[in-house]
């Protein structure tokens, strides 16, 4: 005979679950579907990931997201995790927001980002609900810098980047400082591929770095180079 009252708790149908912390009176729920829509927008050495919540929340409101990263070397096609070498704008696991920025990406590397949606019952199933997006980083190459000439009080410096990338650069920023002086530095901006740094001290080493400025922001910086002005004994404007 049917009982006069309903049961105090019901078994869940296949594919539905109660999390251990769920009260018996709570409806059965299931893991969410994958994030609905994922975009990866590259900006120099950064990528902004944005996604929309799953279309099916599984009947729960405790959805969190995890982002993982894989990088692939174009030459060999080999891939590997890149968590150790990139920086996230916030911890990439247990995210409640639907966007994150990933920075410190390497030029000419292919990245695949996976965004997984989870809720309180996701741990009770083996399947995962995720979406992936890939992006290639096309940040400008670091400029190759050369010392073209020097005098007792000046250094003439030139640089180059691959011709296909030159159209993306609107200016170059040259930063230089006296070696051993960490507190002050000078900055020169130019549209060309060379600059003469004047009013320098004789027989002194200067640290020089060149960075391309593009519409997306800063390109990769060159190496920090050490260039030395002539000593007064060897004066005259000598080409290197």
């Amino acid at each position: 005979l049917p009982s006069p009252e309903g049961a105090t708790s019901c078994e869940c149908e296949e594919g539905f679950f109660r999390a251990p912390q769920d009260p018996a009176s709570m409806p059965c729920t299931r893991p969410p579907s994958a994030p609905h829509y994922l975009t990866a927008v590259g900006m120099g050495a950064k990528v902004e990931l944005r996604w929309t919540p799953p279309q099916d929340s599984g009947g729960r409101e405790d959805i969190v997201y995890s982002v993982t990263c894989e990088q692939c070397w174009p030459e060999s096609g080999e891939c590997g995790p890149c968590e150790a070498s990139v920086r996230y704008s916030e911890p990439p696991h247990g995210l409640t927001r639907t966007s994150v920025t990933v920075s410190d990406l390497e030029p000419h590397m292919n990245y695949t980002f996976t965004v997984e949606a989870r809720n309180g019952v996701s741990g009770l199933v083996t399947s995962r609900s995720f979406r992936t997006a890939s992006v290639s980083i096309n940040q400008t190459e670091p400029p190759k810098v050369r010392l073209e000439g020097r005098s007792t009080t000046s250094l003439s410096v030139s640089w180059s980047i691959p011709p296909p990338q030159q159209s993306r650069v609107w200016k170059y920023e040259v930063t230089y400082r006296k070696k051993g002086d960490s507190n002050s530095y000078n900055v020169r901006r130019t549209e060309g591929f060379s600059v003469t740094l004047d009013d320098l001290a004789p027989d002194t080493t200067y640290l020089v770095q060149v960075q391309a400025l593009t519409q997306e922001g800063q390109g990769a910086g060159s190496k920090v180079h050490e260039f030395q002005t002539l000593s007064p004994e060897g004066s005259g404007n000598l080409a290197v």
Epitope: P142, L147, R150, L155, K179, G180, S182, T205, L207, Q209, A220, G221, S222, K223, V224, H225, E226, F227, Q228, T229, L230, V240
Partner: antibody, heavy 130, light 108 residues
Framework: QVQLQQWGAGLLKPSETLSLTCAVY????????WSWIRQPPGKGLEWIGE??????????NYNPSLKSRVTISVDTSKNQFSLKLSSVTAADTAVYYC?????????????????????WGQGTMVTVAS | SYVLTQPPSVSVAPGQTARITCGGN??????VHWYQQKPGQAPVLVVY???DRPSGIPEQFSGSNSGNTATLTISRVEAGDEADYYC???????????FGGGTKLTVL
């Protein structure tokens, strides 16, 4: 081809002064910054400091963690440079290496501080124990 | 002071490719040098200036460097490559030489 040969006392008591010498055979002694590097047993490499002798001036540069106890000097007549580390403790037990950088320090205005080390001495194991 | 971070160990099967990383703030602006050290021996320079090889070093050793990570790649790994590997840079801010903590490469 430059070669480095080093020697010095291998067993010291705490508070004594470690003393090692490295002889440079071949190459231009004054063009390079010469370094000392050490490696405690089972651990990584630690740069101790460097010296360059140009004209009559010695240019020294030391690891800040050891600076108060380290002296690196040169004897240009013998193409040798030496390391002294005072007030040693058991923590100074290590293999000590002398090393030559790949390139002369400055060539035509282009300088290479902290260059790669392409030639190393054979290493001297120094033990500090009471 | 400037810090270089290496994984303590990397394992790889013979014939495969090993990648050893060296992490440091904006390391791409620095020249990175790599050494191989076998037990009881002095270190040997295998790559300098990020990707150049000294004479006598086989082309299976290569390097790259950008952003915050430099990488030493050893292709077609063989048993003789089992050793400790160290990265090194010059820190222009302090004018000091800095070594990474070292990575033990094990060939399975």
């Amino acid at each position: 081809q430059v070669q480095l040969q080093q020697w010095g006392a291998g067993l010291l008591k705490p508070s004594e002064t470690l003393s090692l010498t490295c002889a440079v055979y071949g190459g231009s002694f004054s063009d390079y910054y010469w370094s000392w590097i050490r490696q405690p047993p089972g651990k990584g490499l630690e740069w101790i400091g460097e010296i360059n002798h140009r004209g009559s001036i010695n240019y020294n540069n030391y690891n800040p963690s050891l600076k108060s106890r380290v002296t690196i000097s040169v004897d240009t007549s013998k193409n040798q440079f030496s390391l002294k580390l005072s007030s040693v403790t058991a923590a100074d037990t290590a293999v000590y290496y002398c090393a030559k950088p790949l390139r002369p320090h400055c060539t035509n205005g282009v300088c290479y501080s902290g260059d790669a080390f392409d030639i190393w001495g054979q290493g001297t194991m120094v033990t500090v124990a009471s | 002071s400037y810090v270089l971070t290496q994984p303590p160990s990397v394992s790889v099967a013979p014939g495969q490719t090993a990648r050893i990383t060296c992490g440091g703030n904006n390391i791409g602006s620095k020249n990175v040098h790599w050494y191989q050290q076998k037990p009881g021996q002095a270190p040997v320079l295998v790559v300098y200036d990020d990707s150049d090889r000294p004479s006598g070093i086989p082309e299976q050793f290569s390097g790259s460097n950008s952003g915050n990570t430099a990488t030493l790649t050893i292709s077609r790994v063989e048993a003789g490559d089992e050793a400790d590997y160290y990265c090194q840079v010059w820190d222009s801010s302090s004018d000091h030489v800095v070594f990474g903590g070292g990575t033990k490469l094990t060939v399975l």
